[in-house]
């Protein structure tokens, strides 16, 4: 959501959110590090593009345009001069002036060491429990921010992980329409449309750079859980890894990870939607998990196949009209689960990315929630893998990424929401080896993948 | 100035636990990490691990998971090490000190002067 | 793990002179690496940081270089107060592991 520094009445009367990087001479004297030519304090450039005629609210939600709702001016920073005060650098950067590269490599889970393995686990929960050192979150929309009195600005601490919670679900809950008016549902800014991929790649790029710099680890990255095994059971779900099943209760996490103790945010989704309130970080009920348990629906009993990703990575346009859910023969689509893994729409099927979460049958398989289990980090680094091993073989072709008349939220140039600084999802569309600091260590399955007798 | 001063010398059982402290001076320890490292006689410098004062985060070398406990009392500017089964092995200097995250500098950039613990029956 | 390979263990060299100690990670580490002088009886001291940064208030006479997985520290022109251990220790990956350690001493 928005800096600390920038949770204020000032901050918000004026629209401008450009704090001190080292202010020797006092507030306001080294906005955006500009006293080092780091950056400087520029207005907002937000995506008026029009949108797909499917939300007609236009004006009544805080995500519209994003950020212009709060903020008008923001940080621009120069060359590899990156951050909310242009004080880090651009992912694939570090030193003191941005200019030396770094490479980290997402590994598969199920291929680190023991100590590594017990490293990331410890991490995640550290993360649980550590307050966001820079963000914090809106409890109100923008017109009830500063409170009743007009005085107090309704922001709220959380933790980075919980963060990393808050900011899916802000982007996918409903638009409020007013007190005693049903909200409107028939909206998403990272889901069923072409910055699904973009905008979950930057979530968790902004994950992993929260927890390298937690750890004070510039190597730490977040690995991946390999879904596409066509198996009807959670490999990572161990123990030692994300949390086997419970003995007392099937839907639950076994009491010997620590992902038991762990307790979900945004649950109260009634509150949400008819008192016109946010998700705050209060943590309510226990993360529930029932893998292959779904009894009443059989075809999400089963992970994807591997040939499922191998066939998916043969379809070679980005996105196709309506870019939307229901597109055919659009990688995205593909990838996201709408389709069948050729790439034909089928409103009965639920494929790759959709297929994993709604495997796992429970917190993790609903949309406002499912971050909450973390194996949505894992299961959306292989996505994000996936995705980056479209790019490689097709050149990061950007040309069927609609500018224009995509589902809000979801154009080209869309500042992705409620990301700060504002990140397009152009920024994204792009090799992450090369561009984004990081790599994935994987073999990829061909089309002709058996399984052997 | 910058300052790290530690505590004094211990003589301990083996078995025994060892609380040693680090006070700061010219420095608030909520901007920093503070960071610990052994050194046996006659031997290298050797990470233990890190405690992060502002929110009581730790991290340790797995050797001395267990072990080593970090706490931190940012009312006082002071950290802390506390060393639990104490064996012979740990016999040593334990510096403590802290590094300067501005731009993930990599340094440890100030010294405690070392507090020597013997480990002796 | 990344392990720090420190060479030589030990040198000797006479005042004027310059000497080079260099450290091997077993991996990549980017230039996230220091170099410390200790003296007898001393806490370490920082000399270098990010590879090649001079830290405030040390001679020019020291630098740092390198880059990836081989990095030096070079001392040119030898005061008999160099004499003292000299380890380099990395910030890529926890554990932040330090070198074995150098043993230089002034003729």
């Known amino acids: 959501q928005f800096p600390r520094q920038c949770a204020t009445v000032e901050a918000l009367r004026s629209g401008m959110c450009c704090p001190d990087l080292s202010p020797v001479s006092g507030p306001g004297t080294d906005r955006c590090g500009s006293s080092s030519g780091r950056g400087r304090c520029e207005a907002v450039t937000a995506d008026s593009r029009p949108h797909s005629p499917q939300y007609p609210h236009d004006g009544r939600d805080d995500r519209e345009v994003w950020p212009l709702r709060f903020f008008n001016r923001t940080c621009h920073c120069n060359g590899n001069f990156s951050g909310h005060n242009c004080g880090t650098c651009r992912p694939g950067w570090r030193g003191a002036a941005c200019d030396q590269r770094v490479l980290i490599v997402r590994r598969n889970l199920l291929d680190l060491s023991k100590e590594e393995k017990n490293h990331f686990v410890r991490a995640l929960d550290m993360a649980k429990r550590t307050t966001h050192p820079l963000f914090v979150i809106a409890t109100r929309r923008s017109e009830e921010i500063l409170g009743p009195d007009g005085n107090t600005p309704q922001f709220e601490n959380i933790s980075i992980y919980n963060y990393f919670v808050w900011t899916h679900y802000y982007s996918v809950k409903k638009t409020f329409l007013g007190v005693g008016q049903e909200s409107f549902g028939e909206v998403d800014f990272s889901h069923e449309g072409p910055a699904f991929l973009t905008w979950h790649r930057y979530h968790l790029l902004r994950l992993e750079k929260d927890m390298q710099e937690m750890l004070q680890e510039p190597s730490f990255s977040l690995p991946y859980w390999n879904f596409a095994t066509g198996k009807n059971v959670c490999d990572i779900c161990t123990d030692d890894l994300m949390g086997s099943r419970s003995n007392f209760d099937s839907t639950l996490i076994s009491p010997n990870s620590v992902f038991s103790q762990w307790r979900v945010v945004c649950d109260s989704l009634e509150d949400y939607d008819t008192l016109g309130t946010l998700c705050n970080s209060t943590e309510d009920g226990p993360i529930r998990r029932n893998p292959a348990g779904n009894v009443a629906r059989p075809m999400v009993q089963r992970l994807p196949e591997p040939q499922d990703v191998a066939q998916c990575l043969e379809v070679g346009l980005f996105d196709t009209p309506p870019f939307y859910s229901n597109s055919t023969n659009s990688f995205r689509n593909t990838v996201e689960g709408y389709s069948d893994p050729t790439g034909k729409y089928d409103p009965a099927v639920r494929s790759l990315h959709n297929l994993a979460h709604l495997f796992l049958n429970g917190t993790g398989g609903q949309t406002h929630l499912s971050p909450n289990d973390p194996i949505f980090v894992l299961l959306h680094t292989f996505t994000d893998a996936v995705f980056d091993e479209w790019l490689r073989r097709y050149n990061a072709d950007i040309s069927t990424f609609p500018l224009e008349n995509a589902p809000i939220g979801h154009n080209r140039q869309y500042n992705m929401v409620p990301f700060w600084p504002p990140v397009t999802n152009t920024e994204m569309f792009v090799t992450a080896p090369d561009n984004l600091g990081y790599t994935y260590e994987i073999q990829w399955p061909s089309r002709e993948f058996s399984v052997p007798e | 100035e910058v300052q790290l001063q530690q505590s004094g010398a211990e003589l301990v059982r083996p078995g025994a636990l060892v609380k040693l402290s680090c006070k700061t001076s010219?420095?608030?320890?909520?901007?920093?990490?503070l960071h610990w490292v052994r050194q046996r006689p006659d031997q290298g410098l050797e990470w233990i691990g890190w405690i992060n004062p502002d929110n009581g985060n730790t991290v340790y070398d797995p050797k001395f998971q267990g072990t080593a406990s970090l706490t931190a009392d940012t009312s006082s500017n002071t950290v802390y090490l506390q060393l639990s089964g104490l064996t012979s092995e740990d016999t040593a200097v334990y510096f403590c000190?802290?590094?300067?995250?501005?731009?993930?500098?990599?340094?440890?950039?100030?010294w405690g002067q070392g507090a020597s613990v013997i480990v002796s029956s | 793990c990344i392990q720090m390979s420190q060479s030589p263990a030990s040198l000797s060299a006479s005042v004027g002179e310059t000497v080079t100690i260099t450290c091997r990670a077993s991996g990549n580490i980017y230039n996230y690496l220091a170099w410390y002088q200790q003296k007898q009886g001393k806490s370490p001291h920082l000399l270098v940081y990010d590879a090649k940064t001079l830290a405030d208030g040390v001679p020019s006479r020291f630098s740092g270089s390198g880059s990836g997985t081989q990095y030096s520290l070079k001392i040119s022109s030898l005061q008999t107060e160099d004499s003292g251990n000299y380890y380099c220790q990395h910030f890529w990956s926890l554990p932040f592991t330090f070198g074995s350690g150098t043993k230089l001493e002034i003729k």
């Open positions: 000190t802290r590094r300067d995250y501005t731009y993930e500098k990599a340094a440890l950039d100030y």
């Open positions: 010219g420095f608030n320890i909520k901007d920093y990490f």
